[in-house]
Amino acid sequence: MRRGPRSLRGRDAPAPTPCVPAACFDLLVRHCVACGLLRTPRPKPAGASSPAPRTALQPQE
């Protein structure tokens, strides 16, 4: 049985490595992948409160 890629990581893992442009950090397996491989939360309806903060998931600027 294949172990989950995150099984051996501790709570104090270092911050995610910056991804190259057009790559996003996959928080579930802790590495950079093409952004198109990840599915982001559904966008909030117009006028919804509290926009989601920027995270390491998004491409580096």
Epitope: P5, L28, L37, L38, R39, P41, T55
Partner: antibody, heavy 117, light 111 residues
């Protein structure tokens, strides 16, 4: 809108193998994560495992070596195989897909499995 | 495994009042400044429905009566005001560490 639909037997005998299919529409299983979750009669939910965009699998250690999750990208389906079932595997089985934080925002309706001789 | 303990197991609240459900994790579910804690509602014969993700973010289409708070090991789901349609079982879930785990559920009833 992503839609998931489970299919498979409703009754399996002890020691047999359970095989379930999750058919996905509205998105490709070559992106994201594709999970199996089950709910036992006492209302406990258990995460069983996933297969992700790259075909990488993760299995809950509680299921030991009994579980296998595979996929057929040409059919946009993924599959659960659970070997050597017992009455303890009686549950409602769901397929679901999470977004980037692991929160599962799309679920199938579930298929109820009874393991009985 | 991270164990999630929900309390109370069942809760009866009057219409229009506040319902508060607690979820305590056996270890922190925070990483990268994110709380990997989510809340679901499940009604009989239906799959769970995502209400809150990342501890406090309201899922699209969920009414603002639902809110989440907390970080580290202690999290709270609040429903205010409670409506008849809220009768269900509520679950917390963590995705910080494998295997992902769920709380035991809290059954909400109307008093």
């Amino acid at each position: 809108e992503v839609q998931l639909q489970e299919s498979g037997p409703s009754l399996v005998k002890p020691s047999q193998t359970l095989s379930l299919t999750c058919s996905v529409t509205g998105d490709s299983i070559t992106r994201g994560y594709w999970n199996w979750i089950r709910k036992f009669p006492g209302n406990k939910l258990e995460f069983m495992g996933y297969i992700n965009y790259s075909g990488t699998t993760y299995y809950n250690p509680s299921l030991k070596s009994r579980i296998s999750i595979t996929r057929d990208t040409s059919k946009n389906q993924y599959y659960l195989q659970l070997n050597s079932v017992t009455t303890e595997d009686t549950a409602t089985y769901y397929c679901a897909t999470p977004h980037t934080y692991g929160a599962m925002d799309y679920w199938g309706q579930g298929t109820t499995l009874t393991v009985s001789a | 495994d991270i164990v999630l303990t929900q309390s109370p197991v069942s809760l009866a609240v009057s219409l229009g009042q506040r319902a508060t459900i607690s979820c305590r994790a056996s270890e922190s579910v925070d990483d990268y400044g994110i709380s990997f804690m989510h809340w679901y509602q499940q009604k009989p014969g239906q799959p769970p429905k995502l209400l809150i993700y990342r501890a406090s973010d309201l899922e699209s289409g969920i009414p603002a009566r639902f809110s989440g708070s907390g970080s580290g090991t202690d999290f709270t789901l609040t429903i205010n005001p409670v409506e008849t349609d809220d009768v269900a079982i509520y679950y917390c879930q963590q995705t910080s560490k494998d295997p992902w785990t769920f709380g035991g559920g809290t059954k909400l009833e109307i008093k």
